[in-house]
């Protein structure tokens, strides 16, 4: 049970909290998910480092509560979504409180530097935010609850410290708790007030319902400082590995089943890829090659590691690269596959590689990618790189083997050569043609060789033949006499082949041509 001491959502006028400095937190009127007007505080001083913006509530009377809860609903912008901001951008803020017997003059500058604040916690945007429609805009709203105490003074102030985030404090609710009357674990317990300390436990005597087994005597439930019931001793329940039988007995879970905790109602069949060979198992062990992540409950199937990513596509633009790939064929039975990029800078011959410099930038990040795409920049020009794309899931850390990966070799800032502008016939025989050509206007590197494509004009282009030349001349042999051949040439550098040149036609000599040429050569 909760009793509210302050709730900004019920405020009809300005909250009138104190901001220091004035250029920090700003009170703004907004809308909640029901289009009710709410008072919010926002701050977004992300361009300047060393931010220290404080926001202090009005005085809150504790009404005899010893332990206080603060529920904060807020939205934080990802630093990555903010244009051109420095690394000092934050996605967290701090919560403090200050105990006092009376209202104090918070406008005085001395209060900010001398008040003995007590830090409650650093508050971060949780991964499990809810998408809420605030006045026509879908926002990622985080709800975080923190508690503090014991309190002895008449009341207190809350203080929120921003040190470089772009965020909005949508609502703050301050309350305390009592443990309600409940039926739990086969016993009935009365309503009980919480204790003075966060560690204090207030004993409540319970009565087992018929046919529940007393774990210990006397049967006790403890109301902790957070207003939650705890059962450290004397529980009326069946222990792990055993289940209630008609609420009168606890029988062992048969082989192939398990019961993980006292709170579970009954035995369950072992999940996929696990087994329990004996009776009374509290957990099913994973089969070889299958694992549980640290936070996987015993009820879920054991899972395996993913296979490697597939079909990598790389797009090189000077000293930047975009890598895209397809997800692994096998996810290991999990839906938390992420990707890590291992960047290695190599020697020209690729015989040895080393880890990339720290200044290489990965967008959105290098590790824990959720999308099959990464943009990599600030690489060295004209440098070979190898990128390993690892597929990781929640159980990869449990496997003795390294993560499956796919590698891609890339050389930065190296364009393919431009087209060869023209070809000349040097000579021709009945069965050969000798050609020459100039180097491409933009070789974009050292030309390794040329590839010549040729085919008889009467025939289909798809039946073409290929020849290679280390220089910019080539003799094509094995041709038929008196035939017209269509010829194209393209250059190759380490970056690959350029485009083929335009099609040019050349003809071998006929038998008559050849004889007349011989006659002309006679003295």
């Amino acid at each position: 049970m909760e009793e509210t001491l302050m709730d900004t959502r019920t405020a009809t006028a300005e909250l009138g909290w104190t901001a220091n400095p004035a250029s920090g937190w700003e009170e703004v009127s907004g809308y909640d998910e029901n289009l009710n007007t709410i008072r919010t505080y926002q701050v977004c001083n992300v361009f300047e480092p060393n931010q220290n913006n404080w926001l202090l509530t009005t005085f809150i009377n504790r009404r005899g509560a010893h332990r206080i809860y603060t529920e904060m609903r807020f939205t934080v912008r990802d630093c990555s979504s903010l244009p051109n901001v420095p690394g000092s951008c934050k996605e967290t803020f701090n919560l403090y409180y200050y105990e006092t017997d009376s209202v104090i003059a918070t406008k005085k500058s001395a209060f900010w530097s001398e008040a003995p604040y007590l830090k409650v916690d650093t508050i971060a945007a949780d991964e499990s935010f809810s998408q809420v429609d605030f006045g026509g805009r879908l926002m990622k709203v985080n709800t975080e609850v923190r508690s503090f105490g014991p309190l002895t003074r008449n009341g207190f102030y809350l203080a929120f410290q921003d040190y470089g985030a772009c965020m909005s404090l949508l609502s703050v609710r301050v309350f305390f708790k009592k443990c309600p009357s409940i039926v739990q674990n086969f016993a009935v317990f009365p309503e009980t007030m919480t204790g003075a300390e966060s560690t204090s436990l207030v004993i409540a005597r319970g009565t087992c319902i018929p046919n529940a087994e007393e774990v210990d005597v006397p049967i006790k439930l403890y109301c902790n400082g957070d207003g939650e019931w705890m059962v450290p001793i004397g529980r009326c329940t069946c222990k792990a590995g055993y289940e209630p039988e008609n609420s009168v007995a606890c029988k062992a879970c048969p082989a192939g089943t398990f019961k993980a905790s006292q709170e579970a109602e009954g035995c369950s069949h072992c999940p996929s890829n696990s087994r329990s060979p004996s009776e009374a198992s509290p957990i099913c062990t994973c089969r070889t090659g299958y694992y549980r992540a640290d936070f996987d409950p015993p009820e879920v199937a054991c899972t395996s590691v993913p296979s490697g990513p597939r079909n990598v596509i790389s797009i090189v633009n000077e000293t930047s690269i975009i890598l895209e790939w397809h997800p692994p064929r096998e996810t290991g039975g999990r839906d938390d596959v992420t990707y890590n990029i291992i960047c290695k800078k190599c020697r020209a011959d690729r015989r040895s590689c080393s880890r990339c410099d720290d200044n290489v930038e990965f967008v959105p990040r290098q590790l824990g990618l959720t999308e099959c795409r990464v943009s990599i920049s600030s690489l060295w020009a004209h440098t070979p790189y190898t990128f390993d794309i690892q597929a990781i899931n929640g159980v990869s850390s449990k496997s003795p083997f390294p993560p499956q990966h796919v590698s891609v070799n890339i050389t930065t800032n190296q364009a393919a050569p431009s087209t060869v502008p023209i070809m000349h016939q040097v000579s021709a025989t009945m069965r050969s043609i000798t050609l020459s050509w100039p180097q491409p206007e933009q070789p974009n590197g050292i030309i390794l060789d040329y590839e010549i494509r040729y085919y008889e004009k009467e025939h289909n282009e798809f039946n073409s033949s290929m020849a290679r030349s280390q220089t910019n001349t080539a003799r094509i042999d094995g041709l038929r006499p008196g035939m017209v051949y269509v010829v194209q040439v393209r250059a190759r550098t380490v970056a690959g082949y350029g485009k083929f040149s335009g099609k040019m036609c050349f003809q071998t000599l006929t038998d008559d041509d050849y004889k007349s040429e011989l006659r002309e050569q006679l003295p």
Epitope: S23, Q42, C44, N45, V46, F47, E48, P49, T75, V76, R77, L82, P83, N84, V85, P86, G135, G136, R137, L138, C166, M167, S168
Partner: antibody, heavy 121, light 106 residues
């Protein structure tokens, strides 16, 4: 009050250079990025890019690399746009604008009055 | 580059009438869209950011909505000082402006 003050009109010959200042006052210069926007006569707005006033790191939009340079002098709270090798098609009003970031979105909330640069032989 | 297309190019309305301006993006920009007003011989003025949040000092007759690729700016009752050119601008990927919609007196 918060304002951005730009210099008066400039007339330049093709091939020349121009440096347009934008002096900020009424706020902490390094707390906000500065954007540059071009508007050719009778045309719409074209975003040229921005500069982080804290780090000096510029970002240029497509079509505004090479001849266009953003720079700063934080000691006098001034941002500069320099255009070299001027062409007739560079004739336009050039605006500086403060970039305001909030948790709800971004926008250019304070604008200079604009500087008309005319390129003519 | 994300292209923003505004329609109509010109909107003729009488004072007191409602004006609805449209802006369509070539691909999704989420809620990363702003609206600006520009009067002849003046610098633009920020009206809306985050697709629907009014900038400081903007009258509540100006409202905006939309997300993804389709956005709308509405002037509930057009005042004489509202006749101007209105531009949308996205900041989802780099920044680009629409070509503008001129609101003129009918």
């Amino acid at each position: 009050q918060v304002q951005l003050l730009q210099s008066g009109a400039e007339v330049k010959k093709p091939g020349a250079s121009v440096k347009v200042p934008c002096k900020a006052s009424g706020y902490t210069f390094t707390s906000y990025a500065m954007s540059w926007v071009r508007q050719a006569p009778g045309q719409g707005l074209e975003w040229m890019g921005w500069i982080n006033t804290n780090t000096g790191n510029p970002t240029y939009a497509q079509g505004f690399t090479g001849r266009f340079v953003f720079s700063l002098d934080t000691s006098v709270s001034t941002a500069y746009l320099q255009i070299s090798s001027l062409k007739a098609e560079d004739t336009a009003v050039y605006y500086c604008a403060r970039v305001r970031l909030t948790v709800y979105g971004d926008g250019m909330d304070v604008w200079g009055q604009g500087t008309l640069v005319t390129v003519s032989s | 580059e994300i292209v923003l297309t505004q329609s109509p190019a010109t909107l003729s309305v009488s004072p007191g009438e409602r004006a609805t301006l449209s802006c369509r993006a070539s691909q999704s920009v989420s809620s990363n869209l702003a609206w600006y007003q520009q009067k002849p011989g003046q610098a633009p003025r920020l009206l809306i950011y985050g697709a629907s949040t009014r900038a400081t000092g903007i009258p509540d007759r100006f409202s905006a909505s939309g997300s993804g690729t389709d956005f709308t700016l509405t002037i509930s009752r057009v005042e004489p000082e509202d006749f101007a050119v209105y531009y949308c601008q996205q900041y989802g990927s780099s920044w680009t402006f629409g070509q503008g919609t001129k609101v003129e007196i009918k």
